[in-house]
């Protein structure tokens, strides 16, 4: 029986009776919350032999071991995850042991065994037989391994049952338990699983079989399984289902889950019913069960209850993440913030259509309007009073609205008002209406001529720069001298660059009124010679790298009632020289004969430049004579060579660290300092602890059911 | 895989309350789909009375509103009816059914409840 | 509510022949998301109801080509191109467009 879709088993441990009939868990396993010590051996669930997602234990006492609950849990496909995590044990107060003896199979992600107090036989499992990558599994605060004194069965009368394997240079008993062995297939099967009399299962079957070679006789399927068959792929009309099934057409189209009842139902697509469309696909039509691709971002329509949605923090923007197309009026207050700008962009850059009005009212903190970097259609089919669906009020460092250049955005209908946007210019303004089509729409009082611009310097010069120098890591650049019309209004020039990959940048990127600016800048001050044409090195640049560097003349911006006029320069692209790769990354080396070695490696992180050939060296080294120092042909244990690798294990260090001996005849001395790094990973580790918890808890603690 | 299975007593009173349970095994009832409840009288057709939610909303046939409630207890898995002032009129099969985006997909074998003094 | 009206209400059928059943709905059933949401269900005696058709012309994986279901808006039809004598039971159509659910009476098939 196929139990899902996902089992939550908390407070009251008599839940556990939902497994009994469980052959295949389709979900994750949650068993958690259970405070009072109960007595578990009555409960034993021998039929539940596979978990599709993750298996969650938390806080339940008095259970002391896995083993007799699910004696025959072979496989959990991790096909979700926790966290990261597929096995996650978590402040188990009684568990002694796993006791999993017939795991076999960590399909996908990692395992998770923190804060158990009591929890032993941990170092006794071979988990790099059960998961392909043991390196993220996080096996920390568990009791110590000296206090355990974990036993695999048969050490203590001199007659090992168990099967050897090494880990971390310790070629040790692998065992789940005092009295199971961890299970190993022979050699023969190779990546095959066996049955429990060491038989070779079907290609097909995962973990383990209950007859060698029979596609039918699997505990758990290596791919998919259908009508009672492991199978490699679905067969014609049935499609992928939960990473571990075939299922028909009808079945996909009935699915209503708690988590897809919002959408438009579960589709079909490349041979797999899923809850929606992968990225860069759209349903073909609105009720269709099958996906197209999508022609540019793919479309989302996001409606305002409310009608209008205010922006007014990061926060409010956030709802509006993916969104391509806004039913409704957006109302954008931004006062203050941290990196508004680009944070703006990530979550309203997409969208493309708002069907109501624009109104930008009291931004101080914005200097721009290219967060919107997608807009193009501004509906008006609900308007302000007056008419208007573009409104742009009172936003004091407002300088730019888009790049008319690199921008098409039409009013449908619906006029345009601006006032007191002080640095914002009038010409910006009617350019705006131009590219628009509101041309015309407009009456005298919706565009302000005097309080529109009036601290900005708004009839710009173009400065021109006059010479570019590079090296590997620095730029050198001058430029024309500015002359305004009175030499005294020029105060400094000031410098902008910034790394730029692609030719596509504009002045007003990333750029807020807070502070935050994607640009670097440097201030120039005027030569002293008159003749003298201003300059600039730019130095601490990366090698090979495209910059995109700006000069703007600093200018007093007010005289009288004038407007002044300001310069800058067009946005100059240029790029450093090249300069010596950084090293060849992941060398391996690996004897496939006895003349040949084959070599392989990956690029450099910094190719500093196009990459045109490697150079291979090597040599020949002495033998080590420590190879034959061992009878290999000998039935005794292999010598391990054991490096000496620094660490204290932190639950080892005795109360005064001081007197430890350092070894060899040197006597006592201190225990070496934390170096910066080791210091910098605790920290990291600490934190990363504290996520992880704050993630357990925030997804298994909710309110609790009417 | 899914199962449902109807219980409750075979006889009731009239005037009192029919209460019946749906235990469903292999499927959590929180987890999805709507969870119903379906009458058929004697040599008559179905009559589909109501359904409980995954999220536990509730929607009810309005000639049998004001006399019926479907609830459910998740920590066994199992939902409920309670149909108030029964008469001999109330006598029927009922059926428990989880019914998807579009269709009924797995039903108890029903259970005879008569109404009779 | 809506109400279905099936006809006939029984329906006597030669093995191998044609039968058509009809089911008239008093109001549209077109769901506001474009969808018509009407089933045909298989009662056989002594049994739940299976079904047979979802969304007026879907067959359900494993159910025989001979049946199919047509129609829109109000007018549904399931036709069995051949009967067969594993096919008698009674026939319900059901919309689960618009709450309350409801089926038809009933067609009552059976071999003359």
């Known amino acids: 029986e196929i139990c899902g879709p996902g089992i939550d088993i908390r407070n009251d441990y008599q839940q556990l009776k939902r497994l009994e009939n469980c052959t295949v868990i389709e979900g994750y396993l949650h068993i958690l919350l259970i405070s009072k010590a109960e007595d578990y051996r009555s409960y034993r669930f021998p039929k539940l032999t596979v978990i599709t997602e993750y298996l969650l234990l938390f806080r339940v006492a008095g259970l002391e071991s896995l083993g007799d609950l699910f004696p025959n849990l072979t496989v959990i496909r991790g096909w979700k995850l926790f966290y990261n995590y597929a096995l996650v044990i978590f402040e188990m107060t009684n568990l002694k042991d796993i006791g999993l003896y017939n795991l076999r199979n960590i399909t996908r992600g990692a395992i998770r065994i923190e804060k158990n107090a009591d929890l032993c036989y941990l170092s006794t499992v071979d988990w790099s037989l059960i998961l392909d990558a043991v390196s993220n599994n996080y096996i920390v605060g568990n009791k110590p391994p000296k206090e355990c004194g974990d036993l695999c069965p048969g050490t203590m009368e001199e007659k090992p049952m168990c099967e050897k394997t090494t880990i971390n240079n310790e070629y040790n008993y692998r065992c789940w338990t005092t009295n199971r062995c961890q299970k190993m297939c022979p050699s023969t099967c190779g990546k095959r699983a066996c049955t429990e009399n060491n038989e070779c299962c079907h290609p097909e079957c995962l973990g383990s079989c209950s007859a060698p070679d029979n596609d039918t006789a699997c505990v758990a399927c290596r791919h998919y399984y259908y009508a009672g068959v492991c199978v490699p792929a679905c067969p014609p009309n049935t499609y992928r289902f939960e990473g571990w099934r075939c299922v028909d057409r009808d079945f996909c189209a009935n699915i209503l889950s708690a988590e897809s009842s919002d959408s438009e139902g579960f589709v079909i697509h490349d041979g797999e019913c899923m809850q929606e469309c992968p990225s860069g696909f759209i349903r073909n039509g609105s009720q269709s069960m099958y996906c197209i691709p999508c022609e540019g971002p793919c479309p989302k329509v996001c409606e305002e209850e409310k009608k209008t949605k205010t922006i007014d923090s990061v926060t409010s923007a956030q709802m509006l993440q993916g969104c391509t197309i806004f039913k409704g009026n957006l109302l954008i207050n931004i006062r203050r913030g941290n990196n508004i700008a680009s944070e703006l962009e990530n979550f309203m850059g997409l969208i493309e259509v708002v069907t109501g009005y624009v109104k930008i009212r009291h931004s101080h903190a914005l200097v721009s309007l290219s967060f919107l970097k997608n807009l193009r259609l501004i509906l008006g089919e609900e308007q302000l009073e007056g008419n208007y669906s573009f409104y742009v009020l009172d936003n004091q460092n407002l300088q730019q609205l888009w790049d008319w250049d690199h921008r098409n955005l039409t009013i449908k209908a619906g006029k345009m008002y601006f006032a007191f946007n002080p640095k914002l210019c009038v010409s910006e303004i009617y350019r705006m209406e131009e590219v628009t089509g509101t041309k015309g729409r407009q009456s005298k009082g919706d565009i302000n001529t005097r309080n529109n611009g009036e601290r900005a310097s708004c009839e710009s010069d173009v400065l021109h720069f006059t010479s570019t120098t590079t090296s590997k890591n620095r730029i050198i650049i001058t430029w024309h001298r500015y002359r305004p019309p009175d030499y005294r209004d020029l105060i400094s020039f000031t410098v902008y660059y910034k790394e730029a990959p692609f030719k596509n940048v504009t002045e007003y990127d990333g750029q807020d009124a807070c502070g935050s600016n994607s640009w670097n800048m440097v201030d120039v001050d005027l030569p002293p010679n008159k003749d003298v044409e201003p300059g600039i090195l730019l130095h601490g640049l990366k090698p090979w790298t495209q910059y995109a560097v700006y000069v703007k003349a600093v200018t007093l911006t007010m005289v009288e009632n004038d407007h002044i006029r300001g310069a800058k320069s067009e946005i100059l692209y240029i790029r450093t020289n090249a300069s010596v790769p950084s090293i060849p990354l992941d060398v391996l080396s690996a004897s496939n004969s006895s003349s040949q070695l084959i070599v392989k490696w990956n690029p450099p992180s910094l190719p500093n430049g196009n990459l045109s050939y490697y150079i291979v060296r090597w040599q020949r080294q002495p033998q080590d004579g420590y190879l034959y120092r061992h009878n290999y042909c000998s039935k005794d244990k292999i010598p391990i060579r054991k490096y000496a690798d620094g660490t204290i294990d932190i639950e080892e260090v005795t109360e005064n660290p001081k007197t430890e001996v350092c070894g060899g005849e040197k006597g006592p001395c201190c225990a070496c300092p934390k170096t910066e790094a080791e210091k910098q990973a605790e920290k990291e580790e600490a934190e990363y602890r504290k996520v992880f918890e704050n993630f357990l808890h925030n997804s298994i603690f909710v309110p609790r059911p009417e | 895989q899914v199962q449902l299975q109807e219980s409750g007593p075979g006889l009731v009173k009239p005037s009192e309350t029919l209460s019946l349970t749906c235990t469903v095994s292999?499927?959590?009832?929180?987890?999805?789909?709507?969870w119903n409840w379906i009458r058929q009288p004697p040599g008559k057709g179905l009559e589909w009375i109501g359904y409980?939610?995954?999220?536990?909303?509730?929607n009810y046939k309005p000639s049998l509103k004001d006399r019926v409630t479907i609830s459910r207890d998740t920590s066994k898995n199992q939902f409920s009816l309670k149909l108030s002032s029964v008469t001999a009129a109330d006598t029927a099969v009922y059926y428990c059914?989880?019914?998807?985006?579009?269709?009924?997909?797995?039903w108890g074998q029903g259970t005879l409840v008569t109404v009779s003094s | 509510d809506i109400v279905m009206t099936q006809s006939p209400l029984s329906l006597p059928v030669t093995p191998g022949e044609p039968a058509s059943i009809s089911c008239r709905s008093s109001q549209s059933i077109v769901h506001s998301n474009g969808n018509t949401y009407l089933q045909w269900y298989l009662q056989k005696p002594g049994q739940s109801p299976q079904l047979l058709i979802y969304?007026?012309?879907n067959r359900l994986y494993g159910v025989p080509d001979r049946f199919s279901g047509s129609g829109s808006g109000t007018d549904f039809t399931l036709k069995i191109s051949r009967v067969e004598a594993e096919d008698v039971g009674v026939y319900y159509c059901?919309?689960?467009?618009?709450?309350?659910?409801?089926f038809g009476q009933g067609t009552k098939v059976e071999i003359k």
């Open positions: 969304k007026v012309s």
């Open positions: 292999g499927y959590s009832i929180t987890g999805g789909y709507h």
């Open positions: 059914a989880r019914y998807g985006r579009v269709f009924f997909d797995y």
């Open positions: 409980i939610s995954y999220d536990g909303t509730n």
């Open positions: 059901f919309q689960g467009s618009h709450v309350p659910w409801t």
